[in-house]
Interface confidence: low
């Protein structure tokens, strides 16, 4: 009986035409959201003027569909047994899930000018950013609608830098008709334990970002993992989002419409610093903000970011240490809401339910130069929002799971 | 093998339409992203536009927004092309085309005459 399933289970888990692997991995069977959560700044002016702690009021959730759409050129290597793939983006607002609507206005850092400033240090540089920030009535906050936000806005401080600069500015700017990849990943036809990992990812292994083992590309896409997993399993996957590949470890045992599977979570070890975990020394890769390399909870991307000063954390800077929250009121970081955590089937290592949590942040220094950064007294991370990402597998799919998979072990 | 196969060229009037359309085999045409290409003679080959694969979203050059659409039919396995307001610098060959991520390849058909004439 169970070497039969194993069998049966093997040639379904394997990532070609025909089998139920295949059909679920081009396209998804399950409704995935993002939902956004926006800090609103409260004290704007405080902050410019005085260099106080930042009062931040988050507001949420707004929601989007996303990951709707199939993978596109997907196309099998029988040689080395891998297939090839774009994920393309897209997002679609879902208002009946929102709080508000995507025209709602924020106040948030001005995304442009704290860039701006941390990617042109020289002096001579800086002065003429300030009189075009000035001339373009430009500020250290800006109010922004969500969209604008979000998907992209044309900035008006550089629109007037004389050389040739992006213009448009957005957290997620370009998304709708761009596709993450190119992905190959091994196809599992010649060895089950390797389907769904990535072998490469833009053509490369590695990544060019970070020193050491901390660049390379580990694991699968987290979307599954290859079949029969363990408990005692640390689960790697890669995640474009945060610029780097990172694990999860299992927590406990959970039933999921009536499918056993096991919860993995990313342990806080995972965002700890060099000095708690030796691994994460190539993660730390400038010695001022990091406090040489003893703050924690944040990881710095600008190498991912085209420069741009963003860092990435939990949601509330959920296991990262005090002195990065120190500067910022209104954070109330808790586990229950704010880790990330994958749902796994065992049997076939399929996800049937993750929600991934993070948090995009942006580095704000004090410049003699640009006077609306002039009265800053202390750097700042500035948390511009957090999403949460989950998809569930529907009840169809799970009725589907439990008389082919599951019940056919039990 | 992966073939395309273009049709619908010919002599049109300034100001006139065509379409094109291109037959595709030997892929699953659904999971691929489709583009229309052309060379005018004497010049180098050039984007026209393209069409992701659910036919959601298509991209032109401006030389040809607001007068070119591409569309697909999925279920014919065909990709078109429709020519409005043709002007006389539209003249070319033009090809249809696709690729696959890996192995790294193009592919085209054999081209489709199209001549504007004044």
């Known amino acids: 009986g169970d070497l039969l399933i194993q069998k049966t289970i093997k040639k379904q888990v394997v990532l070609e035409e025909g089998t139920i692997a295949f059909k679920n991995w081009v396209k998804t069977g399950t409704e995935v959201y993002r939902q956004f959560w926006i800090f609103d700044v409260q004290n704007p002016q405080e902050v410019m003027m005085n260099s106080s702690n930042i009062q931040v009021k988050q507001r949420g959730p707004y929601t989007y569909r996303v990951r709707f759409l199939a993978k596109e050129n997907v196309t099998q290597d029988a040689e080395d047994n891998t297939v090839s793939f774009l994920q393309p983006n897209g997002a679609i607002f879902e208002p009946s899930l929102s709080v508000g609507t995507e025209a709602d206005n924020f106040t948030v850092l001005n995304l442009a000018v704290a860039a701006a400033s941390h990617i042109y240090q020289n002096q001579f540089v800086q002065m003429i950013l300030n009189s075009l920030i000035n001339k373009s009535k430009s500020s250290m906050f800006q109010v922004r609608t969500l969209r604008e936000l979000l998907w992209g806005y044309r900035d008006p401080f550089l629109s007037l830098v004389p050389y040739p600069v992006t213009t448009t500015v957005g957290l997620f700017y370009p998304y709708n008709n761009t596709a993450d990849g190119v992905y190959k990943v091994f196809n599992g036809k010649d060895n089950i334990s390797k389907v769904a990992i990535i072998d490469t990812y833009k053509g490369k292994r590695n990544l060019s970002y970070w020193e050491s083992h901390c660049d390379m590309i580990n694991g699968t896409d987290a979307a599954s993992f290859p079949p029969f997993v363990e408990k005692s399993q640390v689960l790697q996957f890669f995640s474009s989002d945060i610029c780097r590949s990172i694990y999860a470890v299992f927590e406990s045992d959970v039933n999921l419409k009536g499918i056993p599977v096991y919860r993995f979570v990313l342990p806080s070890k995972a965002f700890a610093s060099p000095v708690e975990n030796p691994d994460n020394y190539c993660f730390c890769t400038e010695k001022i903000i990091s406090k040489n390399c003893t703050s924690y909870g944040v990881l710095d991307i600008s190498k991912c970011k085209e420069g741009r000063p963003v860092y990435i954390s939990l949601p509330h800077f959920l296991y990262a240490s005090p002195d990065v929250s120190e500067p910022i009121d209104g954070l109330n970081p808790n586990e229950e809401e704010h880790r990330t955590y994958l749902d796994i089937e065992p049997i076939t290592g399929f996800t049937l339910q993750f929600a991934k949590r993070l948090q995009v942040n942006l580095l704000v220094k004090p410049s003699e130069k640009i006077q609306v950064l002039k009265n800053l007294k202390r750097n700042y991370i500035v948390p511009i929002l957090w999403l949460n990402e989950t998809g569930t597998i529907g009840d169809e799919k799970a009725n589907m799971f439990r008389s082919q998979v599951t019940g056919k072990i039990n | 093998q992966v073939q395309l196969q273009e049709s619908g060229g010919g002599l049109v009037q300034l100001g006139g339409s065509l379409r094109l359309s291109c037959a595709a085999s030997?892929?699953?045409?659904?999971?691929?992203?489709m583009s229309w290409y052309r060379q005018a003679p004497g010049k180098e080959r050039e984007l026209v536009g393209g069409?992701?694969?659910?036919?959601?979203?298509?991209d032109y050059v401006d030389s040809v927004k607001g007068r070119f659409t591409i569309s697909r039919d999925n279920t014919k396995n065909t990709v078109y092309l429709q020519m409005n307001s043709l002007r006389v610098e539209d003249t070319a060959v033009y090809y249809c085309?696709?690729?696959?991520?890996?192995?790294?390849?193009?592919?085209w058909g054999q081209g489709t005459q199209v001549t504007v004439s004044s």
């Open positions: 085309h696709t690729f696959s991520v890996w192995p790294p390849n193009n592919y």
């Open positions: 030997g892929f699953t045409f659904s999971n691929y992203y």
């Open positions: 069409i992701n694969m659910t036919g959601g979203s298509a």
